[in-house]
């Protein structure tokens, strides 16, 4: 008998490039095979359960950022000035929320700020919960 | 054929809203279907592995705060004279283990110390491995 | 029917007890166990994926580390001037990359440097996804 | 020590806006909640509103809700309170007070600040 | 919401005297954790309230032990054993156990 294989874990890895005050990161996923999905400028969550959160930029000017799942709850990270990002989180999440950014800049030397390495990483920690698709 | 599914993986969430000077924190499982179990303000470990742990809280006061799993061995974690705490960690756990955490307080404001966003989440990461209930 | 089990996951954990000067670290595994294999004084890796890799480590002098997995590539760590090392990161491994240290001391009282606590710890955060063994 | 210094009090006429700040220092202001308490001319304590310490949750007192909004910036350790469509029984000395939960009490209170509402 | 009711309004006392401020609520102040969240609050003429007393009984930092609680559930005492000049001021009693928080109307405690 083949011994049984995991079916795909639920993760996703989102790059920016740039950030716009009071809006967000605009986030693409460089892979046409993650198993999560990107949504107006989300990332869809499909499966509810921990998930290990990954955030890392280099920004062209200080700016306040703040990673969302749902309203009316605190973020996942908010860095209050920074020029840089390299954190990691455990969050629990569940089917309906988006992860989304919030920017404020601090400058009106341009209209959108310059990320470098910009890079989102989400990794479901419960396969085997609740999904729906 | 139906594909295999995971079996639920052994994590949990807790949450503290008080320490208690030379004693720990008060924790809580605020969901009834856990794969772990507290008992005597512990969370007992039933399956060897790697766990991904988080701790996270902000105190009311300054303290001493230490994240024990066996007797006679380091702490998981120890912060000294701190007022927050939000911090990721990896570590090898065995079965009998019990994660507690031990507080020293150096201020008598109150007699505790209240936590607002306390939370330990512990996530096996070696399912799969050996277990005994 | 047996419920299906988990195959094992991924993961390693390699101590280091000494660094040398512009090579690396002394990397050994102290369990015969273990899913993933050193050789030549990396970590193999045999599925792609996005691994949880913890470094940790006390120095007995100042040093720059940084954590390889690719020529070419940007390093997983890289840390400047210093003398303990306590990180957590995500990162995409995939075939053939081999993790690495380098290390460049910046003193000469002795021709290596010895480390108390030295650990690395990589967990494949995907089975389920490509292997070659 | 713990300081709480109110300032943005004024004279202005029913229906105007205005908007308090407090600034916080001498505790760890980002772990706490925060809370406006007012004190009518000659009269007793109200409590108006409260703020979580990450800011995710509000609370108003009934007579203030659709018309006040409390806020707070933790990078600044100051604590707002955005005043619309003002009325006359809004006069009061407006104080700052923390309360690092509920569970504990209001622990320290700023001086105040005067906020007169008359046509 | 939860009405606080201080008797008496107010209180002429002479130095050294011991007296007492009742304070009732419309509802039992026991919240389900087993605490109850009465306070007592000071404001001295000219300034800003300051906390005595949380928990019912329990005094807060640097203040006197001449000031004590007591009570549970809505009837609860403040007492002020040795009265002295610097002790003059409004006295309110809060609670902090259901939303909104209200206090009492005050006591005015002055010295003779």
């Known amino acids: 008998q083949v011994p049984p294989q995991y079916p795909p874990i639920q993760s996703i890895r989102v790059q920016f490039t740039r950030c716009e005050n009071e809006k967000g990161c605009i986030i693409t996923s460089p892979s046409k095979d993650e198993t999560m999905k990107v949504q107006d400028n989300s990332i869809i969550i499909n499966c509810d359960g921990f998930y290990l959160i990954s955030l890392k930029g280099y920004f062209s000017e200080e700016l306040s950022l703040s990673l969302y799942y749902r309203k009316g709850r605190g973020p996942l990270f908010s860095l209050s000035k920074v020029t840089s990002v390299d954190s990691i989180g455990v969050a629990y999440l569940a089917f309906k929320d988006k992860v989304y950014f919030n920017v404020t800049t601090h400058s009106t030397s341009y209209k959108d700020i310059q990320v470098n390495g910009g890079e989102l990483i989400l990794i479901h920690q419960n396969p085997g919960g609740f999904c729906a698709y | 054929q139906v594909p295999p599914q995971y079996p639920p993986i052994q994590s949990i969430r807790v949450q503290f809203t008080r320490c208690e000077n030379e004693k720990g924190c008060i924790i809580t499982s605020p969901s009834k279907d856990e794969t772990m179990k507290v008992q005597d303000n512990s969370i007992i470990i039933n399956c060897d592995g790697f766990y991904l742990i988080s701790l996270k809280g902000y105190f009311s006061e300054e303290l001493s705060l230490s994240l024990y799993y066996r007797k006679g061995r380091g702490p998981l974690f120890s912060l000294s004279k701190v007022t927050s705490v939000d911090s990721i960690g990896v570590a090898y756990l065995a079965f009998k283990d019990k994660v507690y955490f031990n507080v020293t307080t150096h201020s008598t404001s109150y007699k505790d110390i209240q936590v607002n966003g306390g939370e330990l989440i512990l996530i096996h990461q070696n399912p799969g491995g050996f277990c005994a209930y | 029917q047996v419920p299906p089990q988990y195959p094992p996951i991924q993961s390693i954990r390699v101590q280091f007890t000494r660094c040398e000067n512009e090579k690396g670290c002394i990397i050994t595994s102290p369990s015969k166990d273990e899913t993933m294999k050193v050789q030549d004084n990396s970590i193999i890796i045999n599925c792609d994926g996005f691994y949880l890799i913890s470094l940790k480590g006390y120095f007995s002098e100042e040093l720059s580390l940084s954590l390889y997995y690719r020529k070419g590539r940007g390093p997983l760590f890289s840390l400047s001037k210093v003398t303990s090392v306590d990180s957590i990161g995500v990162a995409y491994l995939a075939f053939k990359d081999k993790v690495y240290f380098n290390v460049t001391t910046h003193s000469t009282s002795y021709k290596d440097i010895q480390v108390n606590g030295g650990e690395l710890i990589l967990i494949h955060q995907n089975p389920g996804g490509f292997c070659a063994y | 020590e713990v300081q709480l210094v109110e300032s943005g009090g004024d004279l202005l006429k029913p229906g105007g806006s205005l908007r308090l700040s407090c600034v916080a220092s001498?505790?760890?202001?980002?772990?706490?909640?925060m809370t406006w308490v007012r004190q009518a001319p000659g009269k007793g304590l109200q409590w108006v509103a409260a703020?979580?310490?990450?800011?995710?949750?509000?609370y108003y007192t009934d007579a203030v809700k659709g018309r006040f909004t409390i806020s707070r910036d933790n990078a600044r350790n100051t604590v707002f309170l955005q005043m619309n469509s003002l009325r006359a029984e809004d006069t009061a000395v407006y104080y700052c007070a923390k309360k690092f939960n509920n569970y504990r009490p209001f622990d320290y209170w700023g001086q105040g600040t005067l906020v007169t509402v008359s046509s | 919401d939860i009405v606080m009711t201080q008797t008496p309004p107010s209180l002429s006392v002479s130095p050294r005297e011991t007296p007492s401020i009742s304070c009732k609520a419309s509802?039992?102040?026991?919240?389900?954790?087993?605490?109850?969240?009465l306070e007592w609050y000071l404001q001295k003429p000219g300034q800003s309230p300051q906390l005595l007393i949380y928990l019912v009984s329990n005094r807060f930092t640097g203040v006197s032990d001449r000031f004590s609680g007591s009570g549970s559930g809505t009837d609860f005492t403040l007492r002020i054993s040795r009265v002295e000049a610097n002790d003059a001021g409004v006295y309110y009693c809060g609670q902090g156990t259901q939303l909104p928080w209200t206090f009492g109307a005050g006591t005015k405690v002055e010295l003779k």
């Open positions: 001498g505790f760890p202001f980002r772990n706490y909640d």
């Open positions: 703020i979580h310490y990450d800011g995710s949750n509000t």
């Open positions: 509802q039992s102040l026991l919240r389900s954790d087993g605490n109850t969240y």
